[in-house]
C-alpha cells in the first residue's frame, strides 16, 4: 500500500495509472467503499462522499491512462485509505494528513515560549523535528516547546514530520517582538544634550500600546517615572512627563527621547517598558547614562564621572600631547597645582576613549576657562 503525506490546508494529488494509455472507466472510493469520483465517458462524476466539493481530477490526463484524485483544502479527517478501481484492479493509497500550528499567535514577545502543536490522524505515530532560524534543532512528538524566545528566533522555522519513512515539511514564520538591543549606554559631558533611541527589531503594520521610562538616578534614593506615553498606529503621544528632567519624545517610531542637558543628578540607569495591545507581557530595554564633569577649583583640577561604569574603565587626566598625569580605575581623579594649558579628562576602556572633556587651565593669576 502506497503512503502519501499531506499538509492541512494544502492540496494533494493521489495518482492512479492504467496500463492502457487511453481514457477508460475509473472510480475513486474511500475505505468505506463510498464513491468519491469517477468518470462516465469524458464527464467527471461525483459520489456522496464528504469530499464532494473538494475533490477533483485532471481530465487532461485521462487520455494518457492517468486518473488522479485531487483533494483541496486538506483536513486531518481526510486521512484514510483511498482506492482507485480501474481495469478490474484496485490501487490503494493511504493518505495521512498532518497540521502544525503555533500555540496562539506567531507574534511572540521576547522571553515568551513558543509551542508548536502537531495535529495528526488517529493511529499515526509521527516524529517531528524543527530547525530554528539560528540553526537550533528541537525534536518531539505531538508538541514541541521552546522557552525563553530570543531575537534570533525570529524568522522561518522549518519543521519536518516523519511517518512511515515519508516526510512532510512545514514552514512557520515566527516574529519575536523585541527591542533591537537589550541594553545601551550613553556617555556624555555635563551640559550636552542626550539622545536615547529605542529601535524595535520588528515591523508590523499597526503598532498600538503604551509605555514608560522608569529611572534610577545614581544619586537618588529611589527610582521614578521620567515619562509615560501611548502608541497608536505607530504615532507616539506623551501622557505624562516629569518636571525635572523635562524629557522630549519624538512623535514617530523608533521611540526617541531627548534629555536637554546631561547633569550629574540624572546619571544612572533606566528601563523603558513597552506594553503592546493584545499581548500579555512587556518589552524592556535598559538604558544607562554616564556623565562627566571636569572642574578647576583654586589649585585643584578634578575630573568626575557619574553613572553605571564598569570597574575596568580608566579615568585619566592629562595635559594635551603629554603622558597621563593621573590614571585610575575610579570615578574621580584630580591633579593639584596643574600646569597651565589644555587638560583632557578621558574615560577609556582598554585604550578606547569613551568620553572626553577638555578644560583650559590658565596661569595662576587668572580664572579657568571651559571651552
Amino acid at each position: 500500500k502506497k503512503v502519501v503525506l499531506g499538509k492541512k490546508g494544502d492540496t494533494v494529488e493521489l495518482t492512479c495509472t492504467a496500463s492502457q494509455k487511453k481514457s477508460i472507466q475509473f472510480h475513486w472510493k474511500n475505505s468505506n467503499q463510498i464513491k468519491i469520483l469517477g468518470n462516465q465517458g469524458s464527464f467527471l462524476t461525483k459520489g456522496p462522499s464528504k469530499l464532494n466539493d473538494r475533490a477533483d481530477s485532471r481530465r487532461s490526463l485521462w487520455d494518457q491512462g492517468n486518473f488522479p484524485l485531487i483533494i483541496k483544502n486538506l483536513k486531518i479527517e481526510d486521512s484514510d485509505t483511498y482506492i482507485c478501481e480501474v481495469e478490474d484492479q484496485k490501487e490503494e493509497v493511504q493518505l495521512l494528513v498532518f497540521g502544525l500550528t503555533a500555540n496562539s499567535d506567531t507574534h511572540l514577545l521576547q522571553g515568551q515560549s513558543l509551542t508548536l502543536t502537531l495535529e495528526s490522524p488517529p493511529g499515526s505515530s509521527p516524529s517531528v523535528q524543527c530547525r530554528s532560524p539560528r540553526g537550533k534543532n528541537i525534536q518531539g512528538g505531538k508538541t514541541l516547546s521552546v522557552s525563553q524566545l530570543e531575537l534570533q528566533d525570529s524568522g522561518t522555522w522549518t519543521c519536518t514530520v516523519l511517518q512511515n519513512q515519508k516526510k512532510v515539511e512545514f514552514k512557520i514564520d515566527i516574529v519575536v517582538l523585541a527591542f533591537q538591543k537589550a541594553s545601551s549606554i550613553v556617555y556624555k559631558k555635563e551640559g550636552e544634550q542626550v539622545e536615547f533611541s529605542f529601535p524595535l527589531a520588528f515591523t508590523v503594520e499597526k503598532l498600538t500600546g503604551s509605555g514608560e521610562l522608569w529611572w534610577q538616578a545614581e544619586r537618588a534614593s529611589s527610582s521614578k517615572s521620567w515619562i509615560t506615553f501611548d502608541l497608536k498606529n505607530k504615532e507616539v503621544s506623551v501622557k505624562r512627563v516629569t518636571q525635572d528632567p523635562k524629557l522630549q519624545m519624538g512623535k514617530k517610531l523608533p521611540l526617541h527621547l531627548t534629555l536637554p542637558q546631561a547633569l550629574p543628578q540624572y546619571a544612572g540607569s533606566g528601563n523603558l517598558t513597552l506594553a503592546l495591545e493584545a499581548k500579555t507581557g512587556k518589552l524592556h530595554q535598559e538604558v544607562n547614562l554616564v556623565v562627566m564633569r571636569a572642574t578647576q577649583l583654586q589649585k585643584n583640577l578634578t575630573c568626575e564621572v557619574w553613572g553605571p561604569t564598569s570597574p575596568k574603565l580608566m579615568l585619566s587626566l592629562k595635559l594635551e600631547n603629554k603622558e597621563a598625569k593621573v590614571s585610575k580605575r575610579e570615578k574621580a581623579v584630580w591633579v593639584l597645582n596643574p600646569e597651565a594649558g589644555m587638560w583632557q579628562c578621558l574615560l577609556s576602556d582598554s585604550g578606547q576613549v569613551l568620553l572626553e572633556s577638555n578644560i583650559k587651565v590658565l596661569p595662576t593669576w587668572s580664572t579657568p576657562v571651559q571651552p
Epitope: 500600546g209 514608560e212 521614578k224 495591545e277
Partner: antibody, heavy 119, light 107 residues
Framework: EVQLVESGGGLVQPGGSLRLSCAAS????????MSWVRQAPGKGLEWVAN????????YYVDSVKGRFTISRDNAKNSLYLQMNSLRAEDTAVYYC????????????WGQGTLVTVSS | DIQMTQSPSSVSASVGDRVTITCRAS??????LAWYQQKPGKAPKLLIY???SLQSGVPSSFSGSGSGTDFTLTINSLQPEDFATYYC?????????FGQGTKVAIK
C-alpha cells in the same frame, strides 16, 4: 520609609467648609504627583483630584469641580484639599495618595481622615 | 468618563482555591490598569500595575492579564491573608476611575 498622614477631617454641616491636610515624609515630595481618593462608608473608592509636582496642573472629578480645590506646599511637604459647599454625599474617608508607582499607579496611601457632612 | 465594571461583586472561596476577578473598561485603556487590595479599616494597597506587572513585595500568587478593555486578576492559591476587597483602576484618562470592588470572603 514613605509616610502620608492626613488631618483636618471631622463633622461639618451641609454647605460648610473644611480643609484637609496631608503631611508627607520619607520621599522627595516635590518630585511626585499627588492625589486625593475618597471612600463613602461601606462603598467603593472614588478618585477626587490630583496635582502635579509644582502645582501648575490640577484635575478633578466632575462631582467636586468648583467646590473643592487641591493645592500643595512643597516647602512644607504638604498636600491640601479645600472643600467648600459640602454636601451629605461628600461624607467619606479621604485618603492622601502618592502617584509614584510605575505606570501612574497609586503606590502609597495615607491611613485616611473621616469627613462627615450632616445637620 | 471611563466606566470600570468588576465581576463578580463577591466570591466565597476556601484557602488554596484559585480565584479570578474580571474588570471591563467601557473603552480601550491599553495597559493603564492597576489592581488594589483593601482590608476592612485599612487603606488600599497596590498589587498590580500596567495590567500585568507585580508590585514589589507582592506575593507571586497574584497575577494580572489583559489589555484594551478586558482585564483579569488571578489569585492562584488563596491564603488566609488574601480575604479582602479588590479594586481595579484605570489611569488612561481623567478622571481616574475604580471598579465597584470584589469582596473575596471565606466560604
Amino acid at each position: 520609609e514613605v509616610q502620608l498622614v492626613e488631618s483636618g477631617g471631622g463633622l461639618v454641616q451641609p454647605g460648610g467648609s473644611l480643609r484637609l491636610s496631608c503631611a508627607a515624609s520619607g520621599f522627595t515630595f516635590s518630585s511626585y504627583w499627588m492625589s486625593w481618593v475618597r471612600q463613602a462608608p461601606g462603598k467603593g473608592l472614588e478618585w477626587v483630584a490630583n496635582i502635579n509636582e509644582d502645582g501648575s496642573e490640577k484635575y478633578y472629578v466632575d462631582s467636586v469641580k468648583g467646590r473643592f480645590t487641591i493645592s500643595r506646599d512643597n516647602a512644607k511637604n504638604s498636600l491640601y484639599l479645600q472643600m467648600n459647599s459640602l454636601r451629605a454625599e461628600d461624607t467619606a474617608v479621604y485618603y492622601c495618595v502618592r502617584e509614584g508607582g510605575q505606570w501612574l499607579a497609586l503606590d502609597y496611601w495615607g491611613q485616611g481622615t473621616l469627613v462627615t457632612v450632616s445637620s | 468618563d471611563i466606566q470600570m465594571t468588576q465581576s463578580p461583586s463577591s466570591v466565597s472561596a476556601s484557602v488554596g482555591d484559585r480565584v479570578t476577578i474580571t474588570c471591563r473598561a467601557s473603552q480601550g485603556i491599553s495597559s493603564w490598569l492597576a489592581w488594589y487590595q483593601q482590608k476592612p479599616g485599612k487603606a488600599p494597597k497596590l498589587l498590580i500595575y500596567a495590567a500585568s506587572s507585580l508590585q514589589s513585595g507582592v506575593p507571586s500568587s497574584f497575577s494580572g492579564s489583559g489589555s484594551g478593555t478586558d482585564f483579569t486578576l488571578t489569585i492562584n492559591s488563596l491564603q488566609p491573608e488574601d480575604f479582602a476587597t479588590y479594586y481595579c483602576q484605570q489611569a488612561n484618562s481623567f478622571p481616574w476611575t475604580f471598579g465597584q470592588g470584589t469582596k473575596v470572603a471565606i466560604k
